[in-house]
């Protein structure tokens, strides 16, 4: 080994070197949180880039660049360091017009903490391993969600558009003539029934066990879906989103109540099956795989 390489190895394995890099990263993160950084922080920025460059040079001199098994670029953690340095020099010395997008990559510096702290490295390693192992579970999850989304599409397509519409039309008024004149939400409230404090018109249905309209109102299927049009089973993609919402239990009881009011109470069976299979079984299966991957990584 050349003297330069010997010195590089000594620096690299020294605990103070790791401490210096860790402190640099943390200080860099603190500086990145500043809203309006003063002018002198520019020089500090150069210092950080210098330290990172020095760290990478030490690693390259000690281990070699890319030829050989244990060289610098053969370690995925060093790819991050390399990208950080490349972007640091790119944003500083190359005129690329609007560099605000490139400046975003400075955030990657915070990720360098992972490669320095051993505990974090284990966790992230486990996370990456679990993602690899999750592929089969993810395929199963997407398949199950797709199947139930298709069932939901068939059962509830258009149902959430049902609204309670005022019965008392003038002599030559039609639903279309009214809809053409409606502009503001206030206009809608004149013709459609709204519960107090509700943003959407009262849902209703045409089956005997679905929600009925109050006296003087009739159930029509018109206008947009609830929640600004985001809650529906009208297309496969919206149905899939609704099913994902059920699986993650994200305010799912509202979707459940809306759908049951529009379609009928019988359809609670659909929701029971989805919650049991999607929310209780699949979610826990995902957690089990992650736990297994973490256990393997620890061993």
């Amino acid at each position: 080994f050349s003297p330069l390489r010997r010195i590089s190895i000594k620096i690299l394995v020294h605990s103070l070197f790791s401490m210096l890099i860790m402190c640099t990263i943390l200080t860099n993160c603190i500086f990145m949180t500043m809203n309006n950084p003063p002018d002198w922080t520019k020089n500090v920025e150069y210092t950080f880039t210098g330290i990172y460059t020095f760290e990478s040079l030490v690693k390259i001199l000690a281990r070699g660049f890319c030829v050989g098994e244990f060289t610098f670029l053969r370690d995925p953690w060093n790819w991050l360091d390399f990208v950080v340095i490349v972007f640091a020099y790119l944003t500083e010395f190359v005129n690329l017009g609007n560099v605000s997008a490139l400046r975003t990559f400075r955030v990657l510096r915070a990720l360098k903490t992972i490669s320095v702290i051993p505990g974090l490295k284990t966790i992230v390693g486990a996370l990456i391993q679990s993602v690899k192992k999750l592929s089969d579970v993810m395929i199963l999850t997407v398949f199950c969600l797709s199947v139930f989304a298709l069932i939901g599409l068939q059962l509830f397509m258009g149902n959430l558009k049902h609204k309670c519409f005022r019965n008392s039309l003038e002599n030559n008024e039609t639903l279309e003539s009214i809809m053409n004149t409606l502009e503001s939400e206030e206009d809608f409230r004149k013709y459609f029934y709204y519960l107090e404090g509700s943003k959407d018109a009262l849902l209703c249905g045409f089956s005997t066990d679905s929600g009925q309209c109050p006296e003087g109102y009739t159930c029509v299927k018109i206008g947009r879906n609830p929640d600004y049009g985001y809650t529906s089973f009208d297309t496969f993609s919206w149905a899939f989103l609704a099913l994902f919402r059920l699986m993650t239990q994200d305010y799912w009881e509202n979707l459940y109540q809306q759908t049951l009011r529009a379609a009928g109470k019988t359809y609670m069976i659909f929701f029971v099956v989805v919650i049991f299979l999607g929310s209780f079984y699949l979610i826990n299966l995902i957690l089990a795989v992650v736990a297994m991957a973490y256990e393997e990584q620890n061993q």
Epitope: N167, L169, L175, T218, C219, V220, K221, I222
Partner: nanobody, 120 residues
């Protein structure tokens, strides 16, 4: 496809009676209301009678007390019994219904109309 078909029109003498029928067919989930309109040349369509889903019936001012509307919910059908007809009642009687079909949104459907001529 939802269709409205009227029948029962024809020539009748003043003071006579006529019974019009309108049947809705196709993929129907719900009928919110069915109405009869009278279309006369050079004039707009005037409401004759309208029956809502809750069986509330509204009559036009010119026919009150003379015309009677009834509904057969099972057959998706309405009847308009016209009594004491006058020459003023002459026109094309068009059936209209606010229907929710299996596919698509609730909208107003119109029939082609049936001609009623009151003349001596």
């Amino acid at each position: 496809e939802v269709q409205l078909v009227e029948s029962g029109g024809g020539l009748v003498q003043p003071g006579g009676s006529l019974r019009l029928s309108c049947v809705a067919s196709g993929g129907i989930i719900n009928i919110n209301y069915i109405a009869w309109y009278r279309q006369t040349p050079g004039k707009q369509r005037d409401l004759v009678a309208r029956i809502s889903s809750d069986d509330t019936i509204k009559y036009g001012d010119s026919v009150k007390g003379r015309f009677a509307m009834s509904r057969d919910k099972v057959k998706n059908m309405v009847h308009l019994q016209m009594n004491s007809l006058t020459t003023e009642d002459t026109g094309v009687y068009v059936c209209s219904a606010l229907i929710t079909p299996w596919t698509g949104d609730t909208r107003t459907y119109w029939g082609r109309g049936t001609l009623v001529t009151v003349s001596s």
